[in-house]
Each structure stands twice: as structure tokens, then as C-alpha cells.
């Protein structure tokens, strides 16, 4: 066991928050300010991320973990680890290359981010539109038109058959 250990890379003993310093006989040196190592055995420490400008610091950098950023109000995170901040739009809008634009008729967006999506097509489910859609809200689908005929109810028995040519009163 001892022989195996001696053959190991001496750097493997360096814990997170340190690096294996080649300039000092491979001893474990603490990460310098503004840097970190999140795993053991590293030969260099990584530069801390800065959260400036549109970014805000959510978590400070430490010797063992990178800083974490979020976005200033009016912007939201995009990408892994909030690598970008994208402009918020109002509900009923979507972000285009030219800025925030209102949703086209027949589409909606109920969030401050993302794209406008088409209103639900109620008829595809055999239903009718109960509440019309807006730029900010999807349509609300209701019962199918057939379900809305007078007397129609899940508890009433079906109406007696009528002679052809007669419509319901």
C-alpha cells in the first residue's frame, strides 16, 4: 500500500481550494485571490467569474467554487449557469432582433420571456371557444358545440328521437 501511494501523483493529495505548485516542489498552495479549484489534484486554479454590468452576484466566488450570477431587473438568465442576460419583454410580446414586438393576432405570450405561441385550436379537440384569446392569454376551450344543445347534460337521459325535419325548440 505504501509503495502504491509513493508511486501516485503527489498532486492528487492537493484538496479543492488549492493547486499543485510546480514552482514549489509540487506542494499544495492555496488558490490566489480571484481564483478557485472545485476539485482536488488540480495543477492550476481557475479564474473566478465576474458578475458586473447587466449581471449581479448571486453567490460570491470562494476558493472552492466559482461565483454565480443572475441578471439585473428587466433581464433574465439564458444559457448554462446564466452565461447571458436577455432583455425581458411585456406579456403579449416577444423578443426579436429589433427588440420587443407585440404578438401577432392568433398568438400569445403570458410570460416576460420566450416567444409568442399560437392560440389553442379548440375545434381540434371537438370543443368550442369559451373565452377568446388575447396577446397575453390563450383561448379557453369549453364544451363541444353539441354539448351545448338545450337539455344536454351528463345526468339527463338522451332526448327522444325526433322526426326528420324537426329542429329542437
Amino acid at each position: 500500500f505504501e509503495r502504491t501511494r509513493s508511486l501516485q501523483d503527489p498532486c492528487s493529495n492537493c484538496p479543492a481550494g488549492t493547486f499543485c505548485d510546480n514552482n514549489r516542489n509540487q506542494i499544495c498552495s492555496p488558490c490566489p485571490p480571484n481564483s478557485f479549484s472545485s476539485a482536488g489534484g488540480q495543477r492550476t486554479c481557475d479564474i473566478c467569474r465576474q458578475c458586473k454590468g447587466v449581471f449581479r452576484t448571486r453567490k460570491e466566488c470562494s476558493s472552492t467554487s466559482n461565483a454565480e450570477c443572475d441578471c439585473t431587473p428587466g433581464f433574465h438568465c439564458l444559457g448554462a449557469g446564466c452565461s447571458m442576460c436577455e432583455q425581458d419583454c411585456k406579456q403579449g410580446q416577444e423578443l426579436t432582433k429589433k427588440g420587443c414586438k407585440d404578438c401577432c393576432f392568433g398568438t400569445f405570450n403570458d410570460q416576460k420571456r420566450g416567444i409568442c405561441r399560437p392560440w389553442t385550436n379548440c375545434s381540434l379537440d371537438g370543443k368550442s371557444v369559451l373565452v377568446n384569446g388575447t396577446k397575453e392569454r390563450d383561448v379557453v376551450c369549453g364544451p363541444s358545440p353539441a354539448d351545448l344543445s338545450p337539455g344536454a347534460s351528463s345526468v339527463t337521459p338522451p332526448a327522444p328521437a325526433r322526426e326528420p325535419g324537426h329542429s329542437p325548440q
Epitope: I47, G53, F75, M84
Partner: antibody
Framework: QVQLQESGPGLVKPSETLSLTCTVS????????WSWIRQPPGKCLEWIGY???????NYNPSLKSRVNISVDTSQNQFSLKLNSLTAADTAVYYC????????????WGQGTTVTVSS | QSVLTQPPSASGTPGQRVTISCSGS????????VNWYQQFPGTAPKLLIY???QRPSGVPDRFSGSKSGTSASLAISGLQSEDEADYYC???????????FGCGTKLTVL
């Protein structure tokens, strides 16, 4: 690799508005800050302002009332407007990319000389 | 005029080591990493050191940076004639939410 190119008039009259454009080629404008810096003859570098690709802006307080920076991601360009010019605005104007991780200005345009004179 | 303070000039002979200082305050250097730029006459500045002590690819290891408290320094070892240029320090300033520069140090190789 990414290159920046400033364009605009070399001579502007006092009280007029300076309009400069920086075209980004060889890379995307997304996920970086885009800065304007100027250098009057024989003087220091002065940060004018920056715009983040998604529209967030910030300006040097000493110039804030006269400056507007905008971005056109579809054209891969960003622009500077500086109004109410005086002779003190005579300078070489640089555009630069500011990295959004460590915030160094890692790519610069070659600069354009702007003279304010009647 | 500049928020960061640099000596206006520095000099050295070929092969020597020279250092250029840059001092600021808690709102800039004290709380943020420092970047250094090299500028030759008639050309744009070039990023030389970022995040206190990191060299972009292509920058010789003769150039090194350090920071302590509200001051930073750029060291050039094995000075060469082609190092004659202006050197600027820069750091983010939290009160501005933007970068501030030093006024530059003109390095002369004697």
C-alpha cells in the same frame, strides 16, 4: 478571428452630433459587452460607455447627458451618438469588445480620428 | 483626471526588469481584477494582462501582473527594445458600473 471596424465622419462641426458605427466581423455580437473608448491627442484613454448585446447600457457619468449607444444584432453592429460637440471631443474613438466573464477588453478596432472644428 | 494613478514614465535598459504601478480605491482595484494594455504610437491598445495575472495567448511570459489591496503592478523582465510603448491599467469600478483607466505609463528602453 473577431475584428472590429469603426466608421463615421472624420470632421464634425461644434454643436453637431457625432455618429459612429462599429461593425463586428468574424464572430457573433451575442454574449459580450461592446464599448466605446476615446483618446484625445496625447491624453488618457477615457471610457465613454458600453452596451450589452441584449440592450443593457451604461455610460460614463461625465458624458451621460450627451451619449447614446445602440446595438443592431441583425447587422452585427453597434453605434455611438454623441451630441453637442465641442473641441474637447476631438479624439481617436475606439470600439472594443469587453468579455463578459473576466471583463477585459480583448478585441479593439483600429480607431477613427474625429476632429471637432468649424 | 484618471481614477487610477500611474507614473507618467518608466525606463530601463535591455535585459533589465521594470515594474509599473497602478493605484486605485476599494471601489475598483480593491474589489475587482485589474487588466493591463499595451499601446504603440498610432495603434489601438492591446490586452496584455487580464484578471490581475493572466496572459492572453501570444503574450510572452516576460510580462506578469500582480495585485495587492488597492494597488496593482505590471512587471516586464528581460526588457527588450520592442517593449517601448505606453502601458495602461484598467479595472471595473463598482460605483460607475463600468471600467476606469489609468492615464498610462510611457516606457522607454534606454
Amino acid at each position: 478571428q473577431v475584428q472590429l471596424q469603426e466608421s463615421g465622419p472624420g470632421l464634425v462641426k461644434p454643436s453637431e452630433t457625432l455618429s459612429l458605427t462599429c461593425t463586428v466581423s468574424g464572430g457573433s455580437i451575442s454574449s459580450y459587452y461592446w464599448s466605446w473608448i476615446r483618446q484625445p491627442p496625447g491624453k488618457c484613454l477615457e471610457w465613454i460607455g458600453y452596451i450589452y448585446y441584449s440592450g443593457y447600457t451604461n455610460y460614463n457619468p461625465s458624458l451621460k447627458s450627451r451619449v447614446n449607444i445602440s446595438v443592431d444584432t441583425s447587422q452585427n453592429q453597434f453605434s455611438l451618438k454623441l451630441n453637442s460637440l465641442t473641441a474637447a471631443d476631438t479624439a481617436v474613438y475606439y470600439c472594443a469588445r469587453t468579455h463578459s466573464y473576466y471583463y477585459g477588453m480583448d478585441v479593439w478596432g483600429q480607431g477613427t480620428t474625429v476632429t471637432v472644428s468649424s | 483626471q484618471s481614477v487610477l494613478t500611474q507614473p507618467p514614465s518608466a525606463s530601463g535598459t535591455p535585459g533589465q526588469r521594470v515594474t509599473i504601478s497602478c493605484s486605485g480605491s476599494s471601489s475598483n482595484i480593491g474589489n475587482n481584477p485589474v487588466n493591463w494594455y499595451q499601446q504603440f504610437p498610432g495603434t489601438a491598445p492591446k490586452l496584455l494582462i487580464y484578471s490581475n495575472n493572466q496572459r492572453p495567448s501570444g503574450v510572452p511570459d516576460r510580462f506578469s501582473g500582480s495585485k495587492s489591496g488597492t494597488s496593482a503592478s505590471l512587471a516586464i523582465s528581460g526588457l527588450q527594445s520592442e517593449d517601448e510603448a505606453d502601458y495602461y491599467c484598467e479595472a471595473w469600478d463598482d460605483s460607475l458600473n463600468g471600467p476606469v483607466f489609468g492615464c498610462g505609463t510611457k516606457l522607454t528602453v534606454l
